[in-house]
């Protein structure tokens, strides 16, 4: 099931998925002056079997100049209204991101790709937050958010992160020592 919304916006922080659950869609967006090739895929889809996950479809962009049109680049699938954007920041690529079964790695960039990636996440997806450069992370708990199905609706859990304006940056998990979680109890699902 697709998540209805974007993860929470934490001031002076960005979020990123380390790996993408099967069912995640990534829009084939092209940068200004380019468009999807005719009959090209609208999106890439993370699919897989019991042993391997990968992205179906390929995104391809071509120069808008090759066609006389003022059409907007890369229309989204009609049924997808929400825009999950993560900026393309190659230094944030984690080393160990896709050993998780049922998950896809970050797709490699395609030629003339837009500067922002628009993902459509599925229930169970986890994203991690880090403070932007020049801000320091104050953790009260996990700096992550998970899309959950609760009481018939999808909802993101609250990341426990505050970014303060000090010249120190935090890292994504995998690039720092793991933090102890404030609650030591197992997760419990509510029943609605």
């Amino acid at each position: 099931e697709l998540c209805d919304d974007d993860p929470p916006e934490i001031p002076h922080a960005t979020f990123k998925a380390m790996a993408y659950k099967e069912g995640t869609m990534l829009n084939c967006e092209c940068k200004r002056g380019f468009r999807r090739i005719k009959s090209g895929s609208l999106y890439m889809l993370c699919t897989g079997n019991s042993s391997h996950s990968s992205w179906d479809n390929q995104c391809q962009c071509t120069s808008s100049a090759t066609r006389n049109t003022t059409k907007q680049v890369t229309p989204q699938p009609e049924e997808q209204k929400e825009r999950k954007t993560t900026e393309m920041q190659s230094p944030m690529q984690p080393v160990d991101q896709a050993s998780l079964p049922g998950h896809c790695r970050e797709p490699p960039p395609w030629e003339n790709e837009a500067t922002e990636r628009i993902y459509h996440f599925v229930v169970g997806q986890m994203v991690y937050y880090q403070c932007v450069q020049g801000y320091r992370a104050l953790h009260r708990g996990p700096a992550e958010s998970v899309c959950k199905m609760t009481h018939g609706k999808t909802r993101w859990t609250q990341p426990q992160l505050i970014c303060t304006g000090e010249m120190e940056t935090s890292q994504f998990p995998g690039e720092e020592k793991p933090q102890a979680s404030p609650e030591g109890r197992p997760e419990s699902e509510t029943s609605c």
Epitope: D5, D6, E9, E82, R155, Q158, E183, E187, S188
Partner: antibody, heavy 121, light 106 residues
Framework: QVQLQESGPGLVKPSETLSLTCTVS????????WSWIRQPPGKGLEWIGY???????NYNPSLKSRVTISVDTSKNQFSLKLSSVTAADTAVYYC???????????????WGRGTLVTVSS | EIVMTQSPATLSVSPGERATLSCRAS??????LAWYQQKPGQAPRLLIY???TRATGIPARFSGSGSGTEFTLTISSLQSEDFAVYYC????????FGQGTRLEIK
Amino acid sequence: QVQLQESGPGLVKPSETLSLTCTVSGGSIRSYYWSWIRQPPGKGLEWIGYIYYSGSTNYNPSLKSRVTISVDTSKNQFSLKLSSVTAADTAVYYCARDILTGYSDWFFDLWGRGTLVTVSS
Amino acid sequence: EIVMTQSPATLSVSPGERATLSCRASQSVSSNLAWYQQKPGQAPRLLIYGASTRATGIPARFSGSGSGTEFTLTISSLQSEDFAVYYCQQYNNWITFGQGTRLEIK
């Protein structure tokens, strides 16, 4: 420091629509989910529903048919409308910051001071 | 709807003594329970969630216990500022609150 402030008419006539607004100051409305909760005089608390900055909502099933919660991110505000009110809707109405943790804990960690709404002709 | 019943309705305790407040659920809510404190004319304040986890800034004299249908909030040594109304809230199946226990000075 984030603060919440409820505002709206203190008196509403029966069968009319109760309308309240909660202003979020000192923080972004886009960082959290936000709820309305009410407390009739001398009674316990009742959760009404929540909203996210995207406009996604979830309502108490017992009030769902009469409740609409909306959000205005440009003003950092969210609002409650409760239609076809009766005397039983007389209560102190609170807005609150709504938290769901990774452990599926769901609670309200920050509240406004509340505003009394009386339903009377 | 899960009904939360708090007892006693009013509890009279002397400052410095221990106070024990009870909350019972009409069906199991696992550990999905929170406690709030409310003083006259003020908004409720979150004390405990997950039945036993203290919220940020809550003094150690407040502790929560229990699971399933029986829960307890204990205030180990009552301070003058602790006299208030206390509510429990379950979130296992939607959200419902108890009717409250008034903690008054004996």
